[in-house]
Amino acid sequence: QAGPLPKPTLWAEPGSVISWGNSVTIWCQGTLEAREYRLDKEESPAPWDRQNPLEPKNKARFSIPSMTEDYAGRYRCYYRSPVGWSQPSDPLELVMTGAYSKPTLSALPSPLVTSGKSVTLLCQSRSPMDTFLLIKERAAHPLLHLRSEHGAQQHQAEFPMSPVTSVHGGTYRCFSSHGFSHYLLSHPSDPLELIVSGSLEDPRPSPTRSVSTAAGPEDQPLMPTGSVPHSGLRRHWE
């Protein structure tokens, strides 16, 4: 008796983070013995799609001509050979940006910071959100990922950095998201350039606790002008 069929490889081109309205192609690569490929989407009736293999039969293409909210989510693929169905691929998380208006990103007290001092990056959203992502350009993964502990909707999240070193310098953007689908992100904020001056060196950034603040009511400032002393957001390293 032969062992289980090897799991296929699943990936997306041009990538797994796609702006609303853009096209994306999902590829599933199995073996030359594959007769059929199946793509499943989490929380959708299975199979989400089926495709015949492309020659030389070791992969199949699943096309999304225009990215919308419906396509965002977690996918796995399988292939069928004469001896049966393969193991599922590792999951592919397809994320859509542009689901909400862009947040605004600020550096407090200033984007010009001396090495060894503290700076806080503040990401503020127009509508209440429960997840905020801080991205550094040319970094492989989100630098920080703040999520509300109790589903509390917040208008902002603070990303404190202390002590600041030259490692912190660079261009940052932030995104916001709702808990009901972390596969749907806002447009990215405008970029923020953090400039670190001075020569104090520290090998690793060490963000401290995060703080979130709810927006004021109507006829008050549209964004908060102070901050609540406790955190409603939980920090995750990614």
């Epitope: 609303w20 208006s101 862009k102 127009r126 509508s127 901050s227």
Partner: antibody, heavy 117, light 113 residues
């Protein structure tokens, strides 16, 4: 390409109501607030209120509260503004506009409403 | 309500010259939470809707020519067109988004001298 396309011009009698539509395309409709702004002939801009298509949340300028009603049809990506008890000073161009962060990055072409007996 | 007052009401400037429009708010638009000024500038040409030029008092909207710039903080703001072009003839509005209701200045009509 983001587009907000509004319904055509209307002529109404005093005391009547008018319902103006604004059909959105080219972006994720549910996640962006849509506001309405009034511009009387030869005059400036006045904010009426907003609706958030995701959950139907609305907020109105006190000046228009009780007369302006905003609704949304998510199936057609369309928002509506109904203005009741029309009077001559309601003669204006009405714009829908997409909110970016309380400011407006895209505007509809405008709908002229004329109130005349 | 925050009252926005623009000056002058109208302005005539020669092609290639600098145009300056001022906007004053009845209270500060500078937020202590993020050190940003909640002010936008729009351009409106005859028969067209307004077009966003500047937000956060000084951030130029994508696609807006760099001859347009915004400055100021607190209650006093300025829109500057560094070298006036024929296509810049329009009415310009400032808008505060610090508090509800959102309010606009009365507009400044810019013409060519």
């Amino acid at each position: 390409e983001v587009q907000l396309v509004q319904s055509g011009a209307e002529v109404k009698k005093p005391g009547a109501s008018v319902k103006v539509s604004c059909k959105a395309s080219g972006y994720s409709f549910s996640g962006f607030y849509i506001d309405w702004v009034k511009q009387p002939p030869g005059k400036g801009l006045e904010w009426i209120g907003y609706i958030f298509p995701s959950n139907g949340e609305t907020s109105y300028n006190q000046k228009f509260k009780g007369r302006a009603t905003m609704t949304v049809d998510k199936s057609t990506s369309t928002v509506y503004m109904e203005l009741s008890s029309l009077r001559s000073e309601d003669t204006a161009v009405y714009y829908c506009a997409r909110q970016a962060f309380y400011y407006f990055d895209y505007w509809g072409q405008g709908t002229t409403v004329t109130v005349s007996s | 309500d925050i009252v926005m007052t623009q000056s002058p009401d109208s302005l005539a400037v020669s092609l290639g010259e600098r145009a300056t429009i001022n906007c004053k708010s009845s209270q500060s638009l500078l937020s202590s939470s993020n050190q940003k000024n909640y002010l936008a500038w729009y351009q409106q040409k005859p028969g067209q809707p307004p077009k966003l030029l500047i937000y956060w008092a000084s951030t130029r909207e994508s696609g807006v020519p760099d001859r347009f710039s915004g400055s100021g903080s607190g209650t006093d703001f300025t829109l500057t067109i560094s070298s006036l072009q024929a296509e810049d003839v329009a009415v310009y509005y400032c808008q505060q988004y610090y508090s509800y209701p959102l309010t606009f200045g009365q507009g400044t009509k810019l013409e060519i001298k």
